[in-house]
């Protein structure tokens, strides 16, 4: 978590700042959503527990050609300690449940806000 905050970041970003920035990006997505997000693409639902940043990235990375979530994908990769590529799945996916990207983002946003409120940044 030392180099989060985008390519223009002048130096290490505190974990609380990185989480706040991710939350702000998800808020932007939900606010600016006019047409169905990512054309209504479906992604695997995840368990919002430990390791969920990687699981979230593994779900969202399978959505291609959706510029609205590209920044989110980059930010999530900063929270995930290993490299994630399309087609990769962790045990945190609820493999029998697919949801729209918009609902996925909404659920993730609420959970991250709770983590921020509780001071759990990593």
């Amino acid at each position: 978590l030392t180099c989060l905050g985008g390519f223009a970041s002048p130096g290490p970003v505190p974990p609380s700042t990185a989480l706040r920035e991710l939350i702000e990006e998800l808020v932007n997505i939900t606010q600016n959503q006019k047409a169905p997000l990512c054309n209504g693409s479906m992604v695997w639902s995840i368990n919002l527990t430990a390791g969920m940043y990687c699981a979230a990235l593994e779900s969202l990375i399978n959505v291609s050609g959706c510029s609205a979530i590209e920044k989110t994908q980059r930010m999530l990769s900063g929270f995930c300690p290993h490299k994630v590529s399309a087609g990769q799945f962790s045990s945190l996916h609820v493999r029998d449940t697919k949801i729209e990207v918009a609902q996925f983002v909404k659920d993730l946003l609420l959970h991250l806000k709770k983590l921020f409120r509780e001071g759990q940044f990593n």
Partner: antibody, heavy 125, light 112 residues
Framework: QVQLVQSGAEVKKPGSSVKVSCKAS????????MHWVRQAPGQGLEWMGT????????KYVPKFQGRVTITADESTSTAYMELSSLRSEDTAVYYC??????????????????WGQGTLVTVSS | DIQMTQSPSSLSASVGDRVTITCRSS???????????LEWYQQKPGKAPKLLIY???DRFSGVPSRFSGSGSGTDFTLTISSLQPEDFATYYC?????????FGQGTKLEIK
């Protein structure tokens, strides 16, 4: 509209337990924290604890630890507070309250914005 | 536990008066995330409390602009700029930054 409706008044014997319910409507309880606060007759407010109904995580005041259990049932949108080993000093009005977030602000923790009507629990032999 | 001490414990004032209630915490209540979860509640006899102010100075929706909050660190203030008849009640400060979260003992605002 948002409402928190609590169960009715209770009279209990010392040493027994009481379970107070708080039924939510107008919002999803998984999007909130649900809190319990009590107020002894003529006294101030005392926060007892909270639950995140999305995962069941709880926080309690140490003085109640082991005697209080806060639970939530997402399917019925109801939060519960059970207090055991009751003593006369537990006579109080017990309130539930929620804290919620909205989707449109990055930092929007709204504190205890809606409260139940209160449940009077009287502990008497 | 963090103690929240309000002063005064009771206060007599008249309609139109400017009233200030202070709340002091026994230690700094800045949360690890940088926010300060200091809140003010109003309670009338036989009724549930109502949220007035959250995060020191954010007014909750529907709360009249005559209510304002300020402060930082350990010292906080609730100000009512011009008392109205419906403002006579008991006011509580509350910190939600460090578990266990705690209320002040209350300030009873009475009609002079």
């Amino acid at each position: 509209q948002v409402q928190l409706v609590q169960s009715g008044a209770e009279v209990k014997k010392p040493g027994s337990s009481v379970k107070v319910s708080c039924k939510a409507s107008g919002f999803y309880i998984k999007d909130t924290y649900m809190h319990w606060v009590r107020q002894a007759p003529g006294q101030g407010l005392e926060w007892m604890g909270t639950i995140d109904p999305a995962n069941g995580n709880t926080k309690y005041v140490p003085k109640f630890q082991g005697r209080v259990t806060i639970t939530a049932d997402e399917s019925t949108s109801t939060a519960y507070m059970e207090l055991s080993s009751l003593r006369s000093e537990d006579t109080a009005v017990y309130y539930c309250a929620r804290s919620i977030y909205d989707d449109y602000h990055a930092d929007d923790y709204y504190a205890m914005d809606y409260w139940g009507q209160g449940t009077l629990v009287t502990v008497s032999s | 536990d963090i103690q929240m001490t309000q002063s005064p414990s009771s206060l007599s004032a008249s309609v139109g008066d400017r009233v200030t209630i202070t709340c002091r915490s026994s230690q700094n209540i800045v949360h690890i995330n940088g926010n300060t979860y200091l809140e003010w509640y109003q309670q009338k006899p036989g009724k549930a409390p109502k949220l007035l102010i959250y995060k020191i100075s954010d007014r909750f929706s529907g709360v009249p602009s005559r209510f304002s909050g300020s402060g930082s660190g350990t010292d906080f203030t609730l100000t009512i700029s011009s008392l109205q008849p419906e403002d006579f009640a008991t006011y509580y400060c509350f910190q939600g930054s460090h578990v266990p979260w705690t209320f002040g003992q209350g300030t009873k605002l009475e009609i002079k």
